[in-house]
């Protein structure tokens, strides 16, 4: 009696179980009563990443430099190419089909987490005692200068965007 189900890494065709092609190879012809499944390796710039019965290999992903992409990991016959973004850019999606420029943190905000190829900059407000006077994708909030340790006094208090202004002890008010 013909089988109704096949073992793992097999497929059912014409009432018989044929071996699937291994990753990196595509199907040329199904097995018969007398012959094994015929498979052929994928060509250059092609891949198949599973045991399969595909008659065509998939094209490797193209990392388009015009979209800010570059190759992070070159594809093989069994794996797709992995794209990432150029320095200063990050992917717009998990699939990394295009890139956008890293966000900068405005004055009054510092970088909490520097951007990576897959995540944007995370900014945080500078709390009292800290400031940032630049727009930057790298700078954290800086602590206000301690006038006391320089034997000076505060002439003007700091803000989240400006450092304190120190002056001599004997200043005229």
């Amino acid at each position: 009696e013909p089988p109704t189900a096949c073992r793992e890494k097999q497929y059912l065709i014409n009432s018989q179980c044929c071996s699937l092609c291994q990753p990196g190879q595509k199907l040329v012809s199904d097995c018969t009563e007398f012959t094994e499944t015929e498979c052929l390796p994928c060509g250059e710039s092609e891949f198949l990443d599973t045991w399969n019965r595909e008659t065509h290999c998939h094209q490797h992903k193209y990392c388009d430099p015009n979209l800010g992409l570059r190759v992070q990991q070159k594809g093989t016959s069994e794996t797709d190419t992995i794209c990432t973004c150029e320095e200063g850019w990050h992917c717009t999606s998990e699939a990394c089909e295009s890139c956008v420029l890293h966000r900068s943190c405005s004055p009054g905000f510092g970088v909490k987490q520097i951007a990576t190829g897959v995540s944007d900059t995370i900014c945080e407000p500078c709390p009292v005692g800290f400031f940032s006077n630049v727009s930057s994708a790298f700078e954290k909030c800086h602590p206000w200068t301690s006038c006391e340790t320089k034997d000076l006094v505060v002439q003007q208090a700091g803000t989240n965007k400006t450092d304190v202004v120190c002056g001599p002890q004997d200043r005229l008010r």
Partner: antibody, heavy 122, light 113 residues
Framework: QVQLVQSGAEVKKPGSSVKVSCKAS????????IEWIRQAPGQGLEWMGS????????NYAEKFKGKVTITADESTSTAYMELSSLRSEDTAVYYC???????????????WGQGTLVTVSS | DIQMTQSPSSVSASVGDRVTITCRSS????????????LAWYQQKPGKAPKLLIY???TRESGVPDRFSGSGSGTDFTLTISSLQPEDFATYYC?????????FGQGTKVEIK
Amino acid sequence: QVQLVQSGAEVKKPGSSVKVSCKASGYTFSTSWIEWIRQAPGQGLEWMGSILPGSGSTNYAEKFKGKVTITADESTSTAYMELSSLRSEDTAVYYCARGDDGSYVRWYFDHWGQGTLVTVSS
Amino acid sequence: DIQMTQSPSSVSASVGDRVTITCRSSQSLLFSVNQKNYLAWYQQKPGKAPKLLIYWASTRESGVPDRFSGSGSGTDFTLTISSLQPEDFATYYCQHYYSYPWTFGQGTKVEIK
């Protein structure tokens, strides 16, 4: 020890001004922020503004800009909070408190004055 | 401005009870550079000035009994009184000091049941 002593209770007419004082002792007055907080009858605490006496630098809550003037006199270690154009809604207890001491890490209010009741009534 | 929301607004409890008051801020009070939460707790008794209990969200002020403890991080904070004493019946306020303007929670009144 740190002490903040405020001026006595005041009764004022609507439209007038009031100036509350806060005399500090037991610490370096010029390098520590003085904060002003008010509490209307049966209500919560509301921050009004602050001053760093040594520099004269001030911060005000948006609501109190143009309504409140905070000053300090280093020679007498006294801070002042002047409230203008008084209305009945300004009836409250006004507190001064010590904020950061120049270390930039003590922004909480560790010492408070006893409070000054300002009553605005015609 | 950072909004501070306390709950409950009042709680009735007996001497010896464990009391928990929560405070939520509209933005994170945790600063990554120093890993500190810019939050304080105060106790106020009728006719008296507020008294500092806790700062940096969990550091007890000198002289404050250890039945008072603060916890939490980011936007959610808790003040716990482990075993309520007669002198603890008062109103409690949280306050942030992350950035101007400083703001307080609306207060939680701890009343005798």
